[in-house]
């Protein structure tokens, strides 16, 4: 027998430097949690222990601090260079700053192979990326060769930027016949390594013969055996087992996100390859495990220019952008127009003739906003003011419901209405009239909702059992602010940009902004 | 396949400036940086810098940086060294490499400068 | 600079024979090492980066092993045509800095 140890992080999402226990800004250092300079301590005294050791990441290191905003990729490729990982898996978020943005930064600088089976390139972009991702690598491990084939969302073109020269294939119809090649190779130990979301790896793990392990990522699942040492709350036991088509039992593994766990599977192989045992566990990494004292020092160097970032201008306002509470949870805010149509113009993707954007649809709680910015400081915007107003490190994100789900939504925003509460809704592309003299729950007189289905965008009245796409922060989507029904009832949830970085690269393309109060939200009742 | 052509062998004055080239084929020349390595006789090898193609962007040994100017011309797909102020000890057989996960892979077959007065 | 010290300078072996050769950092270079082949007049030709990995077509009796500090090459049967001179380098950072190389003879 011939055991290998496969350490694997995903959904890292730019949190090089430790965070709260919440994934947040860290701020009581003897609390926090994650970070590069901590991962790398846990897995040098792994490697160092144990003889046959992989480290992987199933994609999704792009995206989601201001350490992204700055250096755009470059401190992925650096840092996971730092640790030495041994192959990535491309995510959604690589994608966020078009196929240039991924070339540039990242493929070209990593030293270590980035994967990806189901992402084909075409037209001139086909030679320009040929040899930067792979869709597999063959690995020596110790006196062994291991297989790793890798996988991406076939959703990316709606989640992010990729462009029209990169075709998404299904994931099954792609991996298998690498797998197959992989096998002609004499390669008998093969690890699938992508970033479709836990139902897809299940899949994966089901679909495609040869494959003896799944290494996954994009819907943050927290896998754990026994008792979570954290807040997460576990999906399944560590490694959830699938049983294949041809009966094998297929080890399937995720750790969660943002760089709080550090996946640790034990892997026993036979002489044939065949998959005899699997065990582990994430490793939580908390202050208990110290961070790598040269790691921390690189972090101090590059987190210099962070600082010197903060404090520049991304564009001005010439309107005062109303984030009080006063207004946000009561009426319709200028802040909350602004941050929706941020969000909008953040997903646009012209992905089919029919439609002028896959989404056309923003909610947006009122509470999340928690401050103003004054015009009267020569207009300017910093990335500073922003963290002010969104200071929650969260993101925003894409979600299918029902009109059913939406009218919920809508009637929860005023169902104890007059109280300062946070769940009041600021909206885009919505049109809400509410009624208070009514009772709670049939205070919604009139809900219109933007067309997508049409080349001149005009209001609707919205559909129960119609599907929608809707933008919105990741904190309502997990069913924040009592909105329960959202996250029963969503029908599919991506995760999306950081928030800051959203509405600050909207700012910056804007250059002036004026949002104003223009009738998005009305009461019908005189008082109001 | 992969085919890094360097230009003929050069004899040069003290003083003088010499420029190198690498003529790149079978891949797309922007996709990958390229190293410039030297190797002097009886010494080791010296690794004097590396150029991004696509956009010009350059790192240099710090003993060569004064002296040593990388460029490209992407339309031809050729890669350059240019070396000012030649002496002696500059007479070495200076190679081109292809970056592949940050190492050289690729190698020209090399051109001999000779420095003699 | 990274030292990198390569031992033996030179070797004489014979065809079939199994040979190693060590290469040595002055500081830890985090596995980022690559070995390369010159026989005279040709151009060098890479065999293994990252310690381990072999490049395309290169041959599998070549095969490396390390890490930190102290680094391995491996011919398991040397051929007539794997008599060359053997150089180390590592791209751990700049600058890359090469071994003194070892050269292996015919016995």
């Known amino acids: 027998a011939w055991e290998l140890t496969i350490l694997h992080t995903n959904d890292v999402h730019s949190r090089l430097e430790q965070t709260s226990e919440d994934s947040s800004k860290c701020v009581n250092a003897s609390r926090c949690m994650g970070g590069v300079a901590r991962l790398f301590t846990k897995v040098q005294q792994i490697r160092r222990a144990e003889p046959n050791v992989l480290l992987l990441d199933a994609g999704d290191q792009y995206q989601g601090t201001i350490w992204f905003t700055v250096y755009k990729g470059a401190e992925v490729a650096h840092f996971m260079n730092a640790l030495r990982y041994d192959a990535m898996a491309l995510g959604n978020h690589e994608f966020d700053n078009g196929v240039e943005g991924l070339i540039e930064p990242l493929l070209k600088e990593a030293k270590f192979p980035i994967l990806s089976a189901n992402i084909k390139a075409k037209g001139p972009l086909a030679s320009q990326i040929s040899g930067l991702y792979l869709p597999y690598k063959v690995l020596p491990v110790g006196d062994e060769v291991v297989g790793i084939v890798g996988y991406t969302s076939k959703e990316t073109p709606f989640l992010s930027n990729p462009g029209t020269n990169l075709v998404f294939e299904d994931e099954i119809t792609a991996l298998q016949p690498e797998v197959d090649k992989l096998k002609t190779l004499n390669v008998n130990k093969i690890i699938a390594l992508g970033h479709s979301g836990f139902e897809m790896d299940k899949l994966i793990a089901q679909k495609v013969r040869g494959v003896d392990v799944v290494v996954g990522g994009h819907s943050n699942t927290f896998l754990y055996t026994g008792n979570p040492p954290s807040k997460e709350v576990p999906a399944g036991k560590y490694p959830f087992i699938v049983t294949s088509d041809d009966g094998r039992k297929v080890p399937v593994v995720q750790a969660y996100a943002f760089g709080k766990y550090l996946g640790y599977l034990k892997i026993e192989f036979d002489e044939r390859g065949n998959v005899i045992s699997s065990h582990g566990n994430p490793i939580l990494l908390n202050s208990s495990i110290p961070e790598d004292p040269s790691i921390k020092a690189d972090i101090n160097k590059w987190r210099i220019k962070l600082d010197n970032y903060s404090t520049q201008e991304l564009g001005k306002t010439i309107v005062y952008l109303d984030g009080s509470s006063q207004s946000c949870r009561f009426r319709e805010c200028n802040m909350g127009n602004l941050i929706c149509d941020a969000m909008i113009n953040n997903n646009l993707r012209h992905t089919d003739e029919m439609f002028w954007n896959h989404v056309s649809m923003c909610i947006l709680n009122g509470g999340g906003i928690r401050s103003p910015i004054d015009e009267r400081n020569n207009g300017t915007i910093t990335w500073e003011n922003l963290a002010a107003v969104l200071p929650f490190g969260g993101t925003f994100d894409l979600v299918q419901l029902k009109g059913s789900t939406l009218k919920k939504a809508f009637e929860h925003s005023v169902h104890r209405y007059g109280q300062s509460t946070g769940e009041f809704l600021q909206v885009g592309g919505i049109h809400v009239v509410y009624d208070l003299s009514r009772k709670p729950g049939d205070r919604v007189v009139k809900l219109d909702v933007l067309c997508t289905k049409c080349r001149v965008p005009s209001y609707d009245p919205l559909k129960m059992d119609e599907v929608y796409k809707v933008i919105l922060p990741n904190f309502l989507a997990n069913g924040g602010d009592g909105f329960q029904m959202i996250k029963d009832e969503l029908l599919r949830h991506d995760s999306g940009d950081q928030d800051i970085n959203v509405v600050s690269t909207y700012i910056s393309k804007m250059k002036v902004i004026y949002p104003a109060v223009e009738g998005r939200i009305k009461f019908s009742t005189g008082s109001h | 396949q992969v085919q890094l052509v360097q230009s003929g062998a050069e004899v040069k004055k003290p003083g003088a400036s010499v420029k190198l080239s690498c003529k790149a084929s079978?891949?797309?020349?922007?996709?990958?940086?390229m190293h410039w390595v030297r190797q002097a006789p009886g010494q080791r090898l010296e690794w004097i810098g590396n150029?991004?193609?696509?956009?010009?962007?350059?790192k240099y040994n710090e003993k060569f940086k004064s002296r040593a100017t990388l460029t490209v011309d992407k339309s031809a797909s050729t890669a350059y060294l240019e070396l000012s102020s030649l002496r002696s000890e500059d007479t070495a057989v200076y190679y081109c490499?292809?970056?592949?996960?940050?190492?050289?892979?690729?190698w020209g077959q090399g051109t001999t400068v000779t420095v003699s007065s | 600079d990274i030292q990198m010290t390569q031992s033996p300078s030179s070797l004489s072996a014979s065809v079939g024979d199994r040979v190693t050769i060590t290469c040595r950092a002055s500081?830890?270079?985090?596995?980022?090492l690559t070995w390369f082949q010159q026989k005279p007049g040709k151009a060098p030709k890479s065999l293994i980066y990252?310690?381990?990995i072999l490049l395309d077509g290169v041959p599998s009796r070549f095969s490396g092993s390390g890490s930190g500090t102290d680094f391995t090459l491996t011919i398991s049967s040397l051929q007539p045509e794997d008599f060359a001179t053997y150089y180390c380098?590592?791209?751990?950072?700049?600058?890359?800095?090469f071994g003194g190389g070892t050269k292996l003879e015919i016995k």
């Open positions: 150029i991004n193609p696509s956009n010009g962007g350059t």
């Open positions: 500081q830890d270079i985090n596995s980022y």
């Open positions: 490499a292809r970056r592949d996960y940050g190492s050289p892979s690729y």
């Open positions: 380098l590592q791209y751990h950072e700049f600058p890359v800095t």
């Open positions: 990252r310690t381990n």
């Open positions: 079978g891949y797309t020349f922007t996709s990958y940086w």
